[in-house]
């Protein structure tokens, strides 16, 4: 679409320089405002998304304290308010856009009809159109001469939300792109759903039905315009032939004044008919508008009802969740209390056991100490007894004899007895060492 628009614009640029520059400026403004709005929306969504994420973190370690519950409530309220504000803003923007779209559609329809009338209409229609166009706004004219198919198509567009079937431009373009890629095969549904995460399968199917009808009606419209054009051409040719014939026949002179009078009368009749037709069309349009408004309001009410129900459900869900959490916390607290009590009792029992064990151990130690001391004392007394016995053995009464000091000892006396008279007689025999057996047979060389 963008490509087509650019090629069309740039081809015509030199012919409509002023108009083109104005449109270009307008387009740039629109692009800028669209980008700004997109950034703002993304920012709002990011904030909501982040707050939801933070709420997840908070819910991870729930504490049953009033402060914590209050903080949680604040976070939830903040998220809820952000969502509601965002939705309200979007609703207002959307309503404004729908209004603009309707106005634009009406204008386009009028221009389109005007062009179709130029393409199809005979000179009478053109005259009638010109006559009432000075008194009536352009977009309200619906020439009865338009083919039925054209009117059907226009009516269809009006009733179903314009050339995008009440979808926004981005979603519809994506839908068409994917559909064309798959050449309309049913497999394209999956990819459309991937591309448009905001749409349900049911919505896409409905849109597909609408689009099929749209294509069929558009095709019929094109065909009927083509037929009209052909017929028009034929009519023109016939008139031209008749005119040629008339030129060749002799002219009958009428009363000029009478002729003029008749012409004016006819003109007035035609104008009257045209105005009546326009009034009729206007009343039809008005009744249709009323009906669509009524329908719209009903839809809106339904939506509000749905939203209220959703909010109520959400509230109930949150309440039940909080209640559940509370109950869970209470249960956990009781469980913890019971566990702690049991642990305390166990500890007390263990402590008592330990004390009695320590007491037993201390008694045992004391006994051992006493036994040890007793053993040591027994040993001591035994030692003393032994020493006393030894003393008894050693203590013999010996009489003192000082003269003994000068007498030789018995040992000395014995020794003197053995040695004979001293002298240096010849040595008759010198003892030799024994000869080893292995040398006993060998004679010694002198």
């Amino acid at each position: 679409m963008e490509k087509d628009k650019h090629s069309h614009f740039y081809n015509q640029k030199s012919d409509f320089r002023i108009e083109h520059s104005m449109l270009e400026e307008l387009e740039n403004k629109l692009i800028h405002s669209r980008k700004t709005e997109r950034a703002k929306i993304q920012q709002q969504l990011a904030k909501i998304h982040n707050n939801v994420k933070k709420l997840q973190h908070q819910l991870k370690d729930v504490k049953p304290t009033p402060d914590f519950v209050e903080k949680l409530r604040e976070m939830m309220e903040e998220i809820e308010n952000a969502i509601n504000t965002f939705k309200e803003e979007q609703r207002l923007i959307y309503e404004e856009l729908i209004k603009e779209e309707k106005t634009t559609n009406n204008e386009l329809s009028a221009i389109s009809r005007k062009i179709d009338t130029w393409a199809l209409g005979n000179s009478e229609t053109e005259k009638a159109f010109r006559a009432i166009s000075s008194k009536v706004p352009v977009d309200k004219v619906t020439p009865s001469t338009l083919p039925e198919e054209v009117l059907d198509f226009e009516k269809f567009l009006q009733q179903t939300g314009g050339r995008q079937g009440a979808w926004d431009d981005y979603d519809h373009q994506n839908f068409v792109k994917v559909r064309n890629k798959h050449k309309g095969k049913p497999t394209f549904m999956e990819e459309v759903l991937e591309h448009l995460p905001g749409k349900t399968q049911d919505e896409v199917q409905q849109h597909e039905k609408w689009y099929q009808k749209f294509l069929a009606l558009e095709e019929r419209k094109k065909e009927s315009i083509q037929i009209w054009k052909t017929k028009k051409q034929q009519k023109r040719e016939e008139i031209f032939k008749l005119k040629e014939k008339a030129d060749n026949t002799p002219v009958l002179f009428h009363n000029k004044q009478e002729d003029n009078q008749k012409q004016k009368e006819e003109q007035r009749k035609k104008q009257k008919l045209a105005v009546e037709a326009w009034k009729k069309q206007k009343s039809i349009e008005m009744s249709m508008k009323c009906a669509s408004q009524l329908k719209e309001e009903e839809e809106k009410e339904k939506k509000h009802q749905k939203e209220r129900q959703r909010q109520f459900k959400l509230k109930l869900l949150l309440e039940s969740y909080t209640q559940q959490k509370k109950e869970q916390e209470e249960f956990l607290r009781l469980e913890k209390e019971i566990r702690e009590k049991a642990e305390k009792a166990e500890k007390r029992k263990n402590a008592a056991d330990e004390i009695s064990r320590f007491q037993e151990r201390d008694l045992h130690k004391l006994e051992l100490k006493i036994l040890d001391r007793q053993a040591k004392e027994d040993e001591k007394s035994q030692k003393q007894r032994r020493l006393a016995k030894l003393k008894e053995k050693v203590e013999n009464n010996v009489s003192r004899d000082p003269s003994r000091l000068y007498k030789p000892t018995k040992g000395w006396e014995e020794r003197t007895k053995k040695i004979g008279p001293t002298g240096s007689g010849p040595l008759l025999h010198i003892p030799h060492r024994a000869i080893p057996t292995w040398r006993q047979g060998i004679q010694r060389r002198v």
């Epitope: 982040n50 994420k53 973190h57 991870k60 995460p197």
Partner: antibody, heavy 114, light 107 residues
């Protein structure tokens, strides 16, 4: 216990796409967002985006918009990241993580090579 | 986007030493900050979340502190297995952003 299981390494051609799964277990899938992180070769860590499994809401790092698409399949408790129009710049290890980044998947190495 | 300025970018420390890494955010991040450890060939491991909460199973020698814009990670007594790259991560706002990392090596 909490586990985030990722698939094995992927070798893909430039211009192609790849879809990395992150199968979770041990906790309620819809309770926490799933975050995705890129670790380029010899580079720092980069946050790609996250998805809320409850309603499928996503948030992307501007740098990865148009490159990565995050989705979830609640029936199998699995999060997915699809990477499109791959180039050598996308060669990296991709991790999924959740719950304040306390739990991480083991990572999937994606190699883009002709 | 929120910028996370991490320092130092690399450091050497001895076993048993007390180590501190700091991170400064370009705006208040309301303690939505994690400290992540990365080792070659392994998945990142979160040590601290919400600025000062220790992840289950992480040794108590690791601790985190800070608020507003300034945060720090402290290892009270460095051990051999603490070698690796440490990142801070803010998740207060989108997009979530990581610090540049601190490479910690043993002297």
């Amino acid at each position: 216990q909490v586990q985030l299981q990722q698939s094995g390494p992927e070798l893909v051609k430039p211009g192609a796409s790849v879809k990395i799964p992150c199968k979770t277990s041990g906790y309620s899938f819809t309770d926490y967002n799933i975050d995705w992180v890129k670790q380029g070769l010899g580079e720092s860590l980069e946050w790609i985006g996250d998805i809320n499994p409850n309603y499928g809401g996503t948030m992307y790092n501007q740098k990865f918009k148009g490159k990565a698409t995050l989705t979830v399949d609640k029936s199998s408790n699995t999060a997915y990241m699809e990477l499109r129009s791959l180039t050598s710049e996308d060669t990296a290890v991709y991790y999924c993580a959740h719950d304040e980044f306390i739990y991480w998947g083991q990572g999937t190495l994606v190699t883009v090579s002709a | 986007d929120i910028q996370m300025n991490q320092s130092p970018s690399s450091m050497f420390a001895s076993l048993g030493e007390r180590v501190t890494i700091t991170c400064r955010a370009s705006q208040d991040i309301n303690t939505y900050l994690s400290w992540i450890q990365r080792k070659p060939g392994k998945s990142p491991k979160t040590l601290i979340y919400r600025a000062n909460r220790l992840v289950d199973g992480v040794p108590s020698r690791f601790s985190g502190s800070g608020s507003g814009q300034d945060y720090s990670l402290t290892i009270s007594s460095l051990e051999y297995e603490d070698m690796g790259i440490y990142y801070c991560l803010q998740y207060d706002e989108f997009p979530h952003t990581f610090g540049g990392g601190t490479k910690l090596e043993i002297k």
